[in-house]
């Protein structure tokens, strides 16, 4: 239904608080370098304008699209050219090209300082002094560092952030109350950001069909009792929501997400028996809860798929009549029967089925040709099963830190051209699959592990896309969304790589390492490990382990020394020499 004023429509639907928060997120995700105060000023101006449109939808400029209004506002920033360079050229374009231009300049790895957490008392004072500014600052800092963060979900995080401060700033031991909550929000936030980044990459790089296929598979696993028509409706609506959010249309996205949650709760009897608790919660919690809801139980009796998808004489007829609908039904039927498979595996099976039908429905005897199609699934199913089994055994044997190190070595040898910080970040996240998924029973391991790996490898893909250095990474990232993980798994040592020149400075450490947290110290050691492999890609596991053990002993010894800095200088030289000898550098 058309509205005279889109901005008035969204302001009324969302309410002033959510409207302002979402506009702030949108602006911070586009202009990631702008100071907080500048964004607040822009948001206030947009909000005042929206209020005039609510009062009179026929007022001047109220009929303009949100992209036009927001784009015009962003283009008033005085320092656009100095701060953003060529992004300023976007302002010379007309909509919709201008918005597309802004989207293309979103930076997944903006050059922003690390967020340092102040002392608890300092944070509590700031919270009490000006709660509204404090919470806006949170939205701003997260949004500018995560330009694809799912905006309505960020509102949910902000609500929890506020609740944590409200509760803990009046607790007897503020730090004991607050810090674990902030750690949890940080970790969940990073995970949420990465999951949404994959959804946006799926839509933007592989198109709506790819995203819809993913959604059919996931929702069919989650709602196995729902009929295909119901799942299809949810997929269509969900695709619209994510297309909007990934496209920067945050007001429409939040509004449509709320409508979808409302629809799901009104129709839960025909969707899932697991939604009852979610649907009793307030809006933001409700939407989050639905997105995370556990899989419903499968219907007690489901027939084998062979009858409809292999044995029926109408397979090719049904396929030809509506290819995507027929393949969608296949994916739905397969996924609702297999909550134990990863979504990407289900999509590989559907792709194999599609390829077989394309070939066989043009053959002389189609049925004879596709009769054994299900047998082709066997290696596709067994490959991730075996990989997960092997890696969980390795994880259980090594523990998380050493498992991450094994992956660091593995991936540095595969793609040594990738920057060291990216290899460390991605390999550390890959290594977290162990503690995240290996504890699960067999039936939950694959969906946990392989779908998580898809999220992490997408981080590698988006970071690499910004500064491409490896044809192998580009190939694995762009050829097939669902085969990214098998593509990376299949990479062997890059024999074309010319080892990096040895630079002693890379392996020079100072006393400041002693005051770092355990996590930061691990990252320092893992950075050194990647550099070692880049210098000596043919080094054996044993050689690398010996050097890393010596390095750990060196750090421990010097951190206990009275004159730490002298120890690091003198012992460091010895360590570098010994390491060079051990690795034959």
């Amino acid at each position: 239904d058309a509205h005279k004023s889109e901005v008035a429509h969204r302001f009324k639907d969302l309410g002033e608080e959510n409207f302002k928060a979402l506009v702030l997120i949108a602006f911070a995700q586009y202009l990631q370098q702008c100071p907080f105060e500048d964004h607040v000023k822009l948001v206030n101006e947009v909000t005042e304008f929206a209020k005039t449109c609510v009062a009179d939808e026929s007022a001047e400029n109220c009929d303009k699209s949100l992209h036009t209004l927001f784009g015009d506002k962003l283009c008033t920033v005085a320092t656009l050219r100095e701060t953003y360079g060529e992004m300023a050229d976007c302002c010379a374009k007309q909509e919709p090209e201008r918005n597309e231009c802004f989207l293309q300049h979103k930076d997944d790895n903006p050059n922003l300082p690390r967020l340092v957490r102040p002392e608890v008392d300092v944070m509590c004072t700031a919270f009490h002094d000006n709660e509204e500014t404090f919470l806006k600052k949170y939205l701003y800092e997260i949004a500018r560092r995560h330009p694809y963060f799912y905006a309505p979900e960020l509102l949910f995080f902000a609500k929890r952030y506020k609740a944590a401060f409200t509760e803990c700033c009046q607790a007897a031991d503020k730090a004991a109350c607050l810090l674990p909550k902030l750690d949890e929000l940080r970790d969940e936030g990073k995970a949420s950001s990465a999951k949404q980044r994959l959804k946006c990459a799926s839509l933007q790089k592989f198109g709506e069909r790819a995203f819809k296929a993913w959604a059919v598979a996931r929702l069919s696993q989650r709602f196995p009792k729902a009929e295909f028509a119901e799942v299809s409706k949810l997929v269509t609506d969900l695709t619209k929501v994510h297309t909007e959010c990934c496209h920067g249309d945050l007001l429409e996205c939040a509004d449509d997400r709320a409508d979808l949650a409302k629809y799901i709760c009104e129709n839960q009897d025909s969707i899932s028996s697991k939604l009852k608790e979610c649907c009793e919660k307030p809006l933001l919690e409700k939407s989050h809860c639905i997105a995370e809801v556990e899989n419903d139980e499968m219907p007690a009796d489901l027939p084998s798929l062979a009858a409809d998808f292999v044995e029926s004489k109408d397979v090719c007829k049904n396929y030809a009549e509506a290819k995507d609908v027929f393949l969608g039904m296949f994916l739905y039927e397969y996924a609702r029967r297999h909550p134990d498979y990863s979504v990407v595996l289900l999509l590989r099976l559907a792709k194999t089925y599609e390829t077989t039908l394309e070939k066989c429905c043009a053959a002389a005897d189609p049925h004879e040709c596709y009769a054994k199609v299900f047998d082709e699934f066997k290696p596709l199913v067994e490959e991730p099963q075996n990989l997960i089994k092997q890696n969980c055994e390795l994880f259980e044997q090594l523990g998380e830190y050493k498992f991450q190190n094994a992956l660091l070595v593995r991936y540095t040898k595969k793609v040594p051209q990738v920057s060291t910080p990216t290899l460390v970040e991605v390999s550390r996240n890959l290594g977290k699959v162990g503690s995240k998924c290996c504890k699960h029973p067999e039936a939950k391991r694959m969906p946990c592990a392989e779908d998580y790996l898809s999220v992490v490898l997408n981080q590698l893909c988006v970071l690499h896309e910004k500064t491409p250095v490896s044809d192998r990474v580009t190939k694995c990232c762009t050829e097939s969304l669902v085969n990214r993980r098998p593509c990376f798994s299949a990479l062997e040592v890059d024999e074309t790589y010319v080892p990096k020149e040895f630079n002693a400075e890379t392996f020079t450490f100072h006393a400041d390492i002693c005051t770092l947290s355990e996590k930061e110290r691990q990252i320092k050691k893992q950075t050194a490990l990647v550099e070692l492999v880049k210098h000596k890609p043919k080094a054996t596991k044993e050689q690398l382990k010996a050097v890393m053990d010596d390095f750990a002993a060196f750090v421990e010894k010097c951190c206990k020394a009275d004159d730490k800095e002298t120890c690091f200088a003198e012992e460091g030289k010895k360590l570098v020499a010994a390491s060079q000898a051990a690795l034959g550098l």
């Epitope: 007690a300 009796d301 027939p303 798929l305 029967r337 498979y341 047998d375 699934f377 066997k378 039936a443």
Partner: nanobody
Framework: DVQLVESGGGLVQAGGSLRLSCAAS????????MGWFRQAPGKERERVVS????????YYADSVKGRFTISRDNAENTVYLQMNSLKPEDTAVYYC????????????????WGQGTLVTVSS
């Protein structure tokens, strides 16, 4: 520990009948689809028949349709395979298998397997 124990195999003349049983323990039987597979000497293991968790749906390989019947008794934790009009080419080791999740009845979907029972059909 999960155990599937087959029984009822043996030597039978062509045209005769046999009834195989598979007793399951260590799992929630009604949560598993059950299947019978067979492997003839020198050949690959092939699926013969499967039955859904509640017993409402069955799947038969073309080679046994109309001759073999699968049934299950969830109260007794047992699945049965009634084999009529047996042929020499039915000679094989018959394996009972259980699948927590079942879409195609293919071998890779089955989580637990019995040791097998030999069926020999003489001409």
């Amino acid at each position: 520990d999960v155990q599937l124990v087959e029984s009822g195999g043996g030597l039978v003349q062509a045209g005769g009948s046999l009834r195989l049983s598979c007793a399951a323990s260590g799992l929630t039987f009604s949560s598993y689809a059950m299947g019978w597979f067979r492997q003839a000497p020198g050949k690959e293991r092939e699926r013969v028949v499967s039955i859904s968790r509640g017993g409402g749906y069955t799947y038969y390989a073309d080679s046994v349709k109309g001759r073999f019947t699968i049934s299950r008794d969830n109260a007794e934790n047992t699945v049965y395979l009634q084999m009529n009009s047996l042929k020499p080419e039915d000679t094989a080791v018959y394996y009972c298998a259980a699948a927590r999740y079942w879409a195609t009845g293919s071998e890779y979907e089955f989580d637990y397997w019995g040791q097998g029972t030999l069926v020999t059909v003489s001409s």
